[in-house]
């Protein structure tokens, strides 16, 4: 039975040319986190394997930095970065937990961070 919940940074916005940290946190489960995948609309951004460390997809190596923690830092943002991002927690023995973050990259200097919310 999957009892865990993922808390994410929720709906966030950032300025074009800036950077943003995408973060998820898995709680309420004793399952072992074996790997976390970060995806952008079915495109792999990065893998963080609990034992083996980070792998950043070649096409994102110049703009994606691992961390902090299991999170991901996106740099040199463009309006094309607007969209859904997913953190996929592979756990044992529970299975897979998915968190969703929506990022809006704004042309203007007014970029407000959204509230946190939980995904069961």
């Amino acid at each position: 039975m999957m009892t865990g919940t993922i808390e994410t940074t929720g709906n966030i916005s950032a300025e074009k040319g800036g950077s943003i940290i995408l973060q998820c946190h898995l709680s309420s489960t004793t399952a072992q986190v074996t790997q976390v995948n970060w995806e952008q609309q079915d495109q792999l951004l990065a893998i963080c394997n609990a034992d083996l460390g980070w792998h950043i997809s070649p096409s994102f190596k110049d703009r994606v930095a691992p961390g902090p923690g299991l999170g991901l830092t996106l740099q040199s943002l463009t309006v094309n970065d607007t969209g859904e991002y997913f953190c996929i927690y592979h756990t044992y023995p529970d299975g897979t937990y998915t968190g969703r973050i929506f990022l809006e990259v704004l042309e203007s200097s007014v970029a407000e961070h959204g509230a946190r919310f939980q995904i069961p």
Epitope: Q35, D42, L44, H55, F86
Partner: nanobody, 122 residues
Framework: EVQLVESGGGLVQAGGSLRLSCAAS????????MGWFRQAPGKEREGISL????????YYADSVKGRFTISADNAKNTVYLQMNSLKPEDTAVYYC???????????????WGQGTQVTVSS
């Protein structure tokens, strides 16, 4: 859904070698990575090696670095783990795992094989 079948485990003396195979079938068009984990009695499942599909990067746990080698034969949809200079502490059940995209945002994206026992005697 992805199915994984491991083979190649067995009993070997310390200092010996084994090659594990993991054959993947099913929805394997867009696997991100495949890897090997192991679990010794009373211990957590430990990731020991990973190979990625985007650029073939390979990663190893410190405990096996220089002794184990992961490789892939894409034509056969198979991943191998060549294990040399085996030690008694390598004794464990070895599992293959594959990681793919979060299609439909539900279901299992971390497929596990059934495991193969490796026993290293001193």
């Amino acid at each position: 859904e992805v199915q994984l079948v491991e083979s190649g485990g067995g009993l070997v003396q310390a200092g010996g070698s084994l090659r594990l195979s993991c054959a993947a079938s099913g929805n394997i068009d867009r696997l991100y990575a495949m890897g090997w984990f192991r679990q010794a009695p009373g211990k957590e499942r430990e990731g020991i090696s990973l190979i990625t599909s985007d650029d073939g990067s390979t990663y190893y746990a410190d405990s096996v670095k220089g002794r184990f080698t992961i490789s892939a034969d894409n034509a056969k949809n198979t991943v191998y783990l060549q294990m040399n200079s085996l030690k008694p502490e390598d004794t464990a059940v070895y599992y293959c795992a594959s990681s793919g995209p979060a299609d439909a945002r539900n279901g299992e994206r971390w497929a596990w094989g059934q495991g193969t026992q490796v026993t290293v005697s001193s």
